[in-house]
Interface confidence: medium
């Protein structure tokens, strides 16, 4: 069985992984990539494209961050002038940031509701 994937004549498009099977091979999309419209996933003519999670809205970035598309994935970076909250690293999918100017701001006494806290955050945003 010739391993077509390592024979020096790589048969797959550069957007795919070559997977050797007995007597044949497959060209599968790389993780975080998807077949271009109309292209199947597997045959030697497979062509894939990097899923842009940011543009397509398939990301989980917090509103305090900006989504950045990376190859096969995405990351969430603090908005300019903001910093990661409580030692959470920047540039991760779960990054949450806070405004450096108002990092000590707290809701008025007695406000414990998550919804109200978010409301005050929005009011504070409007005041900027």
């Amino acid at each position: 069985d010739v391993n077509e994937c390592t024979s020096g004549q790589n048969p797959c498009h550069s957007s795919t992984h070559c997977l050797n099977n007995v007597g044949s091979y497959q060209c599968r999309c790389r993780p975080g990539w998807q077949p271009i419209p109309g292209s199947p996933n597997g045959p030697n003519n497979t062509v894939c494209e990097d899923v842009d999670e940011c543009s397509s809205g398939q990301h989980q970035c917090d509103s305090s961050t900006v989504c950045f598309n990376t190859v096969g994935s995405y990351s969430c970076r603090c908005r300019p002038g903001w910093k990661p909250r409580h030692g959470i690293p920047n540039n991760q999918k779960d990054t949450v940031c806070e405004d450096m100017t108002f990092s000590t701001w707290t809701p008025p006494p007695g406000v414990h509701s998550q919804t109200l806290s978010r409301f005050f955050d929005k009011v504070q945003d409007l005041g900027r």
């Epitope: 498009h13 550069s14 894939c48 494209e49 990376t70 190859v71």
Partner: antibody, heavy 119, light 107 residues
């Protein structure tokens, strides 16, 4: 046999304009992202413009933004680069290059066309 | 912008030798690195992509390795036609950027 043939190079005065063309054959041009990459006299390679498959999205680094315009005509299998307000630092060998996706390497390269900007 | 640094502008070698050309990225680029060979008077030619995948028709004496920020291109047994320029490139994020090049020359 894949071919990318650039044309339109020449000597231009400082502040002048020029348009390059790149004729493609031997591959499905309309399925490839295309770019212009220049090589300076010191041999440094620099991406100057990129365009997606249908021409609807383009990219320019800050060094050429507002001065260079990349476009393509898939019916004619041709890529273009319109350059204006040319500076001496634009002097280079310009290659047209094809890549299979936004973030994929340059698989196909032309032979290059030279731009010399003189004062 | 991501800066790709090829610390050796020139490397001396002999035919039959094993040689490694290195490239360092200023930030993590995963495995989104390609290597190109450029002979005098010719355009660059893709050798390696995804840091270690050989492009179609590239001889198996060329091997790429690395991930993150440190990458290398190794030629297991240098042939006379390999004595030329090599460039690394990252395609993790725009602007796509290249290293300054390494010229492989005879000792």
């Amino acid at each position: 046999d894949v071919k990318l043939v650039e044309s339109g190079g020449g000597l231009v005065k400082l502040g002048g304009s020029l348009k390059f063309s790149c004729a493609a054959s031997g591959f499905t041009f309309s399925s490839y992202y295309m770019s212009w990459v220049r090589q300076t006299p010191e041999k440094r390679l620099e991406l100057v413009a990129a365009i997606n498959i249908n021409g609807g999205s383009t990219y320019y680094p800050d060094t050429v933004k507002g001065r260079f315009t990349i476009s393509r005509d898939n019916a004619k299998n041709t890529l273009y680069l319109q350059m204006s307000s040319l500076k001496s630092e634009d002097t280079a060998l310009y290659y047209c290059a094809g890549h299979g996706g936004l973030r994929l390497p340059f698989e196909y390269w032309g032979q290059g066309t030279t731009l010399t900007v003189s004062s | 912008d991501i800066v790709m640094t090829q610390s050796h502008k020139f490397m001396s070698t002999s035919v039959g030798d094993r040689v490694s050309i290195t490239c360092k990225a200023s930030q993590n680029v995963g495995t989104s690195v390609a290597w190109y060979q450029q002979k005098p008077g010719h355009s660059p030619k893709l050798l390696i992509y995804w840091a270690s995948t050989r492009h179609t028709g590239v001889p198996d004496r060329f091997t790429g390795s690395g991930s993150g920020t440190d990458f290398s291109l190794t030629i297991s047994s240098v042939q006379s036609e390999d004595l030329t320029d090599y460039f690394c490139q990252q395609y993790s994020s725009y602007p796509l950027t290249f290293g300054g090049g390494t010229k492989l020359e005879i000792k």
